[in-house]
C-alpha cells in the first residue's frame, strides 16, 4: 500500500523535510503533490510526468519544493505555514489512479530563556519570590533547576502559568541557591543562565569569644563577636551599657579589676534593619604577691629542736596551702597548722624534715607558689658501719677498711686498734697482713656542731683461709617430672658449715629440695624446668669463709604441645602457605610435618607456594626430644579455596 | 633435586684469606641450616659451624672462633664461609652441608667439596 | 667439646660377613647418633640419624643401636660396594663432633 513518511516529522523553522514515498507502484505515467489532504488542483504543489521527465509547478509551488524522480518531496526553508497535510496523487499507466497522506509540524527554533524576579533581596522568614521564565512561547514545555538539580519536593514551593512562574513563599537562607529555568519543544531545548537567589537574613544571636569570663590583672582581653547574618552585620560593644567602638573584635591591654563588668555585642543588619545583642559578664580578678617562706630556725637538731616556717606576706581574706615533698601536708602530729593556716610547725624535727616547704597562695584563679625552702637538719652521727663486713682475713692480704656514719655535718672519723688510736681518717689501710694484725678495731665518729660521738667494734681475724669449694652432681641433666639430682658440695671438711644459694637467694622452702649430710648434700626431687637455675654452695669455719662457682642445672624437658602459626585456617588459592611451629622443650625439639598423613620434611617452617584446592587436608607437625623420650604433636585443618571464594580469611603468608 | 654447588679449588699463602661459595637449588633455600665440615687429606672430618640462612645467624667451632664469618645471600641462594689468617694446617676440602632438618638433626646433603691449599 | 671415639679405626672382613663399629661419647647423647660412609674420593653421606633411623634409600643391612654413650653401626652382610670409611657424629646440639672414622675393607 503506497503510504507517506515525513522525515522529520517535527520540523523546525528554516531545516527542511523529506515526504518519502513508500511502495511506490509499478508502471506509473506520473504523479503529483498537493498541499492538504485531498487532491484539489488549486492546491497543486507540483506535477511529474515521468515520460518526459517534466515537472510541472502548481498554484501551491512557492519554489522551495524539489521532487524526485521516486515520487519523494523536499521542502526547503521550511516556514510555520508549511505545518499540516500532503497528499500525493499518483496516475499509473493503465491510468488507476493511487492517493496517499503524509504530514508534519513545525516548530520555532527556541530562543535562550531568562529569569525574571519580583523580588532581587527578599527577606528571609518574610518575604515570596517569584520568578519568571522569559519569553512566554506557543507550545513550550517549562522546566526549573536550583543547583542543577531538579526542583525539591517542598510545601513553599509553587510551580503556576503552566509551570513559567516559580514562586518561592516566606524564603529561608537556605533557598540561597542558583536557578535556572529551561524551555523545551519538540525541535529544541534551551536553558537560562543562572539567577543566584540572594536573600536577606540575621543577624542571628551574636557569640562572644573566647567563652572565659575569668581573667587575672595585667592579663589582655581580646573578645571577639561573630553573628550569622546577610548582608555581614555590623558590630558595636558596650561595657556596663556604655558604647565602646564599632568593630567585631575588642581589645583591651593590661586589665585590671576595674575592667570587670558586663559586655555587649550588639550585630546591626542594616538591610533587614534587624539587631541582636549577646551579653558576657568579665571578671578581673588582682594579681597576688608572689609568696615567701621565712624560718625561726635554719639549722634545727635532730629531736630536740622545733621549726615554725611562716608564708608570707600576710594578706586578709587570703586561703594558704601548703607542701612537703609536692606533696599536700601528710597527717602527722608533728606537724601544726596556724588557725589562718600561714605558720607550718614541725615539732622536734628529723632528719626526715628537710623537705621542700612551699607554700601557696589561693585566689579566685589559681594558687601562686612560693620558692621552695629545704631545712639543713643538724643530726647524727648514728652508729658507724665498718666495711666491708668480713671478719677473717688470710695473711698476705691487704687490710681495707672503710668506716661511715649518717651525720649533718659530716662526721669526722678516728680509728682505734685494741684501744690505741691509730689516725684520723675515714679509710684504715694496713698492707700484707700478719695474725698479730688480729685484733679489735675501733671506728669513732664525731659530730662537731652537736658536740655528739658514737664508736663501733669490729673484731678482725687474720688466718688461713678455707678451699675453694666445687659442687659434684650425680645427673647433669635430669629429665623433668622424672629424675632427682643430689648436688654434694665438696671437700668434706670438720668443723664446716655448708650453705646453698640458688641463683644468688638462699634456699626456697620445698618440699622438692632436702637437705642432707650435714647440710653438705642438697637434692631436689622430681626437677622442674624452673629448677634450672644456678646452684652456689659456700662452706664456712670460725676463721674463714668460701663459695664455689655456680653449677647450671640443665632439665630436659618437653616437648610441649606444640602451637602452628599463623591461626588461620583458610586460604585463598594462589597464596603462600607458610606455617610455623613450635614447642618449649629442652634440648630443641626435631621437627616433622605430614600432610594428610604423608610424612614431609624435618623443617620448624613448612612453606608451599601458590597453594591450591589440591592442598586441603590436615597438617600435622610432630615434635620429638630424644632426651626426654617424649614426643608430642599438634593437627591443623587448611581448607583452599579457589579465588574470589574465600570466605575473607588469610591469603597466606 | 638438591643440590649444593661449591666454587672451585683455590691456592693460598699462609696469613691471606679464602671465600668458598655453595649455591644451593632443589629445595627452599631459607627453611634449612647450612653447615661448613672440613677434611684435611687422609684425616677425618672437622665441624666449623653453621649459618642459619632465613636470620644470618651463625655458631662457630671455638677453634675457629675469630678467624671464620659465614654469610649468606638470599637472592641468590648462596652461602659464604671466609676463613682468614690461613695457616699450613688448614689445607683441607672444606664441604658445606645441608641439615637435614631444623634443631639437633645431621646432615643430609653435601657439597662437593672446594680443595683449599695453603703453601708459601 | 664433647669427644667421639670410635673402634676399631680400621677393619678388614669378608663378603657376606656381620660387621660392627661402636661408637663412644665422652657425655650422654640420649641418642642424638648419627652415622655416614665416605668412600674413597667422594663426599659423605648420611646412613643412620636417631641412633636407628636409616635414611631412605639406604639398605637395611645397616642398622644402628645404643643408648647414653655407647652407640653401634652394624652391617649385617657385609657388600664390596660398603668399602668406604664410616664415622659418627653426635647431633645434639653445637658444636657438632665427629668421630675419627671407621676404615672398612674386603679381605
Known amino acids: 500500500k503506497l503510504t507517506i513518511e515525513s522525515t522529520p516529522f517535527n520540523v523546525a523553522e528554516g531545516k527542511e523535510v523529506l515526504l518519502l514515498v513508500h511502495n511506490l507502484p509499478q508502471h506509473l505515467f506520473g504523479y503529483s503533490w498537493y498541499k492538504g489532504e485531498r487532491v484539489d488542483g488549486n492546491r497543486q504543489i507540483i506535477g511529474y510526468v515521468i515520460g518526459t521527465q517534466q515537472a510541472t509547478p502548481g498554484p501551491a509551488y512557492s519554489g522551495r519544493e524539489i521532487i524526485y524522480p521516486n515520487a519523494s518531496l523536499l521542502i526547503q526553508n521550511i516556514i510555520q505555514n508549511d505545518t499540516g497535510f500532503y497528499t500525493l496523487h499518483v496516475i499509473k499507466s493503465d491510468l488507476v489512479n493511487e492517493e496517499a497522506t503524509g504530514q508534519f509540524r513545525v516548530y520555532p527554533e527556541l530562543p535562550k530563556p531568562s529569569i525574571s524576579s519580583n523580588n532581587s533581596k527578599p527577606v528571609e522568614d518574610k518575604d515570596a519570590v517569584a520568578f519568571t521564565c522569559e519569553p512566554e512561547t506557543q507550545d513550550a514545555t517549562y522546566l526549573w533547576w536550583v543547583n542543577n538539580q531538579s526542583l525539591p519536593v517542598s510545601p513553599r514551593l509553587q510551580l503556576s502559568n503552566g509551570n513559567r512562574t516559580l514562586t518561592l513563599f516566606n524564603v529561608t537562607r537556605n533557598d540561597t541557591a542558583s536557578y535556572k529555568c529551561e524551555t523545551q519543544n519538540p525541535v529544541s531545548a534551551r536553558r537560562s543562565d543562572s539567577v543566584i537567589l540572594n536573600v536577606l537574613y540575621g543577624p542571628d544571636a551574636p557569640t562572644i569569644s573566647p567563652l572565659n569570663t575569668s581573667y587575672r590583672s595585667g592579663e589582655n582581653l581580646n573578645l571577639s563577636c561573630h553573628a550569622a547574618s546577610n548582608p555581614p552585620a555590623q558590630y558595636s560593644w558596650f561595657v556596663n551599657g556604655t558604647f565602646q567602638q564599632s568593630t567585631q573584635e575588642l581589645f583591651i591591654p593590661n586589665i585590671t579589676v576595674n575592667n570587670s563588668g558586663s559586655y555587649t555585642c550588639q550585630a546591626h543588619n542594616s538591610d533587614t534593619g534587624l539587631n541582636r545583642t549577646t551579653v558576657t559578664t568579665i571578671t578581673v580578678y588582682a594579681e597576688p604577691p608572689k609568696p615567701f617562706i621565712t624560718s625561726n630556725n635554719s639549722n634545727p637538731v635532730e629531736d630536740e629542736d622545733a621549726v615554725a616556717l611562716t608564708c608570707e606576706p600576710e594578706i586578709q581574706n587570703t586561703t594558704y596551702l601548703w607542701w612537703v615533698n609536692n606533696q599536700s601536708l601528710p597527717v602527722s602530729p608533728r606537724l601544726q597548722l596556724s588557725n589562718d593556716n600561714r605558720t607550718l610547725t614541725l615539732l622536734s624535727v628529723t632528719r626526715n624534715d628537710v623537705g621542700p616547704y612551699e607554700c601557696g597562695i589561693q585566689n579566685e584563679l589559681s594558687v601562686d607558689h612560693s620558692d621552695p625552702v629545704i631545712l639543713n637538719v643538724l643530726y647524727g652521727p648514728d652508729d658507724p658501719t665498718i666495711s666491708p663486713s668480713y671478719t677473717y682475713y688470710r695473711p698476705g692480704v691487704n687490710l681495707s677498711l672503710s668506716c661511715h656514719a649518717a651525720s649533718n655535718p659530716p662526721a669526722q672519723y678516728s680509728w682505734l686498734i685494741d684501744g690505741n688510736i691509730q689516725q684520723h681518717t675515714q679509710e684504715l689501710f694496713i698492707s700484707n697482713i700478719t695474725e698479730k694484725n688480729s685484733g679489735l678495731y675501733t671506728c669513732q665518729a664525731n659530730n662537731s656542731a652537736s658536740g655528739h660521738s658514737r664508736t663501733t667494734v669490729k673484731t678482725i681475724t687474720v688466718s688461713a683461709e678455707l678451699p675453694k669449694p666445687s659442687i659434684s652432681s650425680n645427673n647433669s641433666k635430669p629429665v623433668e617430672d622424672k629424675d632427682a639430682v643430689a648436688f654434694t658440695c665438696e671437700p668434706e671438711a670438720q668443723n664446716t658449715t655448708y650453705l646453698w644459694w640458688v641463683n644468688g637467694q638462699s634456699l626456697p622452702v620445698s618440699p622438692r629440695l632436702q637437705l642432707s649430710n650435714g647440710n653438705r648434700t642438697l637434692t631436689l626431687f622430681n626437677v622442674t624446668r624452673n629448677d634450672a637455675r644456678a646452684y652456689v654452695c659456700g662452706i664456712q669455719n670460725s676463721v674463714s669463709a668460701n663459695r664455689s662457682d655456680p653449677v647450671t642445672l640443665d632439665v630436659l624437658y618437653g616437648p610441649d604441645t606444640p602451637i602452628i602459626s599463623p591461626p588461620d585456617s583458610s586460604y585463598l588459592s594462589g597464596a603462600n602457605l607458610n606455617l610455623s611451629c613450635h614447642s618449649a622443650s629442652n634440648p630443641s625439639p626435631q621437627y616433622s610435618w605430614r600432610i594428610n598423613g604423608i610424612p614431609q620434611q624435618h623443617t620448624q617452617v613448612l612453606f608451599i607456594a601458590k597453594i591450591t584446592p589440591n592442598n586441603n587436608g590436615t597438617y600435622a607437625c610432630f615434635v620429638s626430644n630424644l632426651a626426654t623420650g617424649r614426643n608430642n604433636s599438634i593437627v591443623k585443618s587448611i581448607t583452599v579455596s579457589a579465588s574470589g571464594t574465600s570466605p575473607g580469611l588469610s591469603a597466606g603468608a | 633435586q638438591v643440590q649444593l654447588v661449591q666454587s672451585g679449588a683455590e691456592v693460598k699463602k699462609p696469613g691471606a684469606s679464602v671465600k668458598v661459595s655453595c649455591k644451593a637449588s632443589?629445595?627452599?633455600?631459607?627453611?634449612?641450616?647450612l653447615h661448613w665440615v672440613r677434611q684435611a687429606p687422609g684425616q677425618g672430618l672437622e665441624w666449623i659451624g653453621y649459618?642459619?640462612?632465613?636470620?644470618?645467624?651463625?655458631s662457630y667451632a671455638q677453634k675457629f672462633q675469630g678467624r671464620v664469618t659465614m654469610t649468606r645471600d638470599t637472592s641468590t641462594s648462596t652461602v659464604y664461609m671466609e676463613l682468614s689468617s690461613l695457616r699450613s694446617e688448614d689445607t683441607a676440602v672444606y664441604y658445606c652441608?645441608?641439615?637435614?632438618?631444623?634443631?639437633?638433626?645431621?646432615?643430609?646433603?653435601w657439597g662437593q667439596g672446594t680443595l683449599v691449599t695453603v703453601s708459601s | 667439646d664433647i669427644q667421639m671415639t670410635q673402634s676399631p679405626s680400621s677393619l678388614s672382613a669378608s663378603v657376606g660377613d656381620r660387621v660392627t663399629i661402636t661408637c663412644r661419647a665422652s657425655?650422654?647423647?640420649?641418642?642424638?647418633l648419627a652415622w655416614y660412609q665416605q668412600k674413597p674420593g667422594k663426599v659423605p653421606k648420611l646412613l643412620i640419624y636417631?641412633?636407628?633411623n636409616l635414611v631412605e634409600g639406604v639398605p637395611s643391612r645397616f642398622s644402628g643401636s645404643g643408648s647414653g654413650t655407647d652407640f653401634t653401626l652394624t652391617i649385617s652382610s657385609l657388600q664390596p660396594e660398603d668399602v668406604a670409611t664410616y664415622y659418627c657424629?653426635?647431633?645434639?646440639?653445637?658444636?657438632?663432633?665427629f668421630g675419627q672414622g671407621t676404615k672398612v675393607e674386603i679381605k
Open positions: 652441608a645441608r641439615e637435614y632438618g631444623n634443631y639437633n638433626y645431621p646432615l643430609d646433603y
Open positions: 649459618i642459619n640462612p632465613q636470620t644470618g645467624y651463625t
Open positions: 632443589g629445595y627452599i633455600f631459607t627453611s634449612y641450616w
Open positions: 636417631n641412633t636407628k
Open positions: 657424629q653426635h647431633h645434639l646440639g653445637t658444636p657438632y663432633t
Open positions: 657425655e650422654n647423647q640420649y641418642g642424638y
